[in-house]
Amino acid sequence: GCDRNCGLITGAVIGAVLAVFGGILMPVGDMLIQKTIKKEVVLEEGTIAFKNWVKTGTEIYRQFWIFDVQNPQEVMMNSSNIQVKQRGPYTYRVRFLAKENITQDPKDNTVSFLQPNGAIFEPSLSVGTEADNFTVLNLAVAAASHIYPNPFVQVVLNSLINKSKSSMFQVRTLRELLWGYTDPFLSLVPYPVSTRVGMFYPYNNTADGVYKVFNGKDSISKVAIIDTYKGKRNLSYWESYCDMINGTDAASFPPFVEKSQVLQFFSSDICRSIYAVFESDVNLKGIPVYRFVLPSKAFASPVQNPDNHCFCTEKIISKNCTSYGVLDISKCKEGKPVYISLPHFLYASPDVSETIDGLNPNEEEHRTYLDIEPITGFTLQFAKRLQVNLLVKPSNKIQVLKRLKRNYIVPILWLNETGTIGDEKAKMFRSQVTGKINLLGLIEMILLSVGVVMFVAFMISYCACRSKTIK
């Protein structure tokens, strides 16, 4: 009887030990995971994060859709609605260059860098060539008339516009429109002014920054958060807190991301910090990720969202700050009347798009999202979508703008910048991060469940045996 009882007690003890070990392994395992993650997400030589941060292993593409104006004469002569037809995608590979001038500062645990710009056309992912022609707003005419509202100078501009045979609209190739062309009207200005114009001019052989970000050595909760941009903590474009540089650059976030978090990030493209909120759980190539989206609230007017009051910088175009869905970034673009919105004026007020025909906003295609792996905080997939518009106003001194009866926020193009973790990288990520965490979880669960089952089973058997023996 003793052998059997001893065996049962031993089994129960082993079960208890396994269960306790499984239970202990939960916090200890979490601690080990946290320790490993904390070590590996620090932005310093030798870590996984640093290697991927210096040069992204993901191929990033920027697709452009150009708004081809169908009725230029009608608009110019009768102030009709602008009829646009989007043409695209025209795809470029971007962000393929490694960060430059990487400098660690151990004093304040930051790392500074420049992000070089480069774009390579991808014909196989495009509907046409860089030589395709488009009828678009004359960028120089619209910008100059806005920068110089002075009636005297507008007379001078009119002479130059007429002499150069420029008009309200122009025909330009994709390459010219995006990367720059010599404008005939600006070429007549008898002072040393930049005569090159383009939506992204200058781009190639330029760099964004200097960025100075926290490397996470002293506090992992600050990793990748921007300390300064171009040597400053503020942008000097907006009033109050709107001017602050908040969060990361969206390529990664501090680890252990919670669904309840509001993820702040700064985008130099839109000259402001913005935020994303959790939308849904997504499985990305076997990796569980959180999808964070830019909410419509971020584009709301101060009437709907008082937090946005400092993004309203003028009262006329914004109809006393009641318009929404467009952001005037002229202060960030040397006074050029550039307005940023979501594609097809998604989440914008009806008054913004009432002068434009041919737009079809839809959330699925036109919103911005980030798919973030919550443990590491890495952005494994994203789609950044934005539209670039230019304001054009009537001018009684400039012949080609004389017959306009209203202001137009004219869409020029919209872009979709996307990146998705590659299959190889995803496999590696699964094995090194997700896989290990899942394995540890599995071991914990097996130990705990086997232990509990063994303990309960052996204890029941032991009790049963004892009661038999007593009888």
Epitope: P149, N150, P151, F152, V153, V155, V156, N158, S159, L160, N162, K163, L188, V189, P190, Y191
Partner: antibody, heavy 117, light 107 residues
Framework: EVQLVESGGGLVQPGGSLRLSCAAS????????IHWVRQAPGKGLEWVAW????????YYADSVKGRFTISADTSKNTAYLQMNSLRAEDTAVYYC??????????WGQGTLVTVSS | DIQMTQSPSSLSASVGDRVTITCRAS??????VAWYQQKPGKAPKLLIS???SLYSGVPSRFSGSGSGTDFTLTISSLQPEDFATYYC?????????FGQGTKVEIK
């Protein structure tokens, strides 16, 4: 070096005419446009006329509208001010000046026009 | 037409003095104001454009300020060669108009 040289001033009877010339060097007048500014003896400056760049529009002060005509000969790089129906109050030193954004960065030395019987 | 009212019409000052001349536009001209210096028998010389922008070659003791309707020309430390008549001018709208001038004389 940018230079503006006025000529053609002199004594003229009321009702008479005079043509002032402004010869430019160091820049092309068509790119900038040329203004005429006058200064009556012991008085302040008064803008008179303007020819916009590239043979653009012409503009005049109300006091000379219909009597004065501004023109330019781009081949000679010279601007002119044709003054008809002259009055005693047109007596002044007439300057030609270069301007693009409305301020005058270069001035001629001036030519005196005296309207007297 | 936009009227430009300059004050004072004349002032007496000594070498080394700080001199301030003001100019008021009858309507908003933003920053489209220029300042000139004129010496007897000579053509005016541009000192400042866009209300604050010092023209090349002009000594840094000259400075301009203001926006909208009120503008100021300041000479931080008057030099012997600065005794002259000063004019403001709006270059916002045709007809271009000048102030009536401020004569700076030796005290």
């Amino acid at each position: 070096e940018v230079q503006l040289v006025e000529s053609g001033g002199g004594l003229v009877q009321p009702g008479g005419s005079l043509r002032l010339s402004c010869a430019a060097s160091g820049f092309t007048i068509s790119s900038f446009g040329i203004h005429w500014v006058r200064q009556a003896p012991g008085k302040g400056l008064e803008w008179v006329a303007w020819i916009a760049p590239y043979g653009g529009d012409t503009y005049y002060a109300d006091s000379v509208k219909g009597r004065f005509t501004i023109s330019a000969d781009t081949s000679k790089n010279t601007a002119y001010l044709q003054m008809n129906s002259l009055r005693a109050e047109d007596t002044a030193v007439y300057y030609c000046a270069r301007s693009f954004f409305g301020y005058f960065d270069y001035w001629g030395q001036g030519t005196l026009v005296t309207v007297s019987s | 037409d936009i009227q430009m009212t300059q004050s004072p019409s004349s002032l007496s000052a000594s070498v080394g003095d700080r001199v301030t001349i003001t100019c008021r536009a009858s309507q908003d001209v933003s920053n489209w104001v220029a300042w000139y210096q004129q010496k007897p028998g000579k053509a005016p010389k541009l000192l400042i454009s866009y209300a604050t922008s010092l023209y090349s070659g002009v000594p840094s003791r000259f400075s301009g300020s203001g926006s909208g309707t009120d503008f100021t020309l300041t000479i931080s430390s008057l030099q012997p060669e600065d005794f002259a008549t000063y004019y403001c001018q709006q270059h916002s709208n045709a007809p271009l108009t000048f102030g009536q001038g401020t004569k700076v004389e030796i005290k």
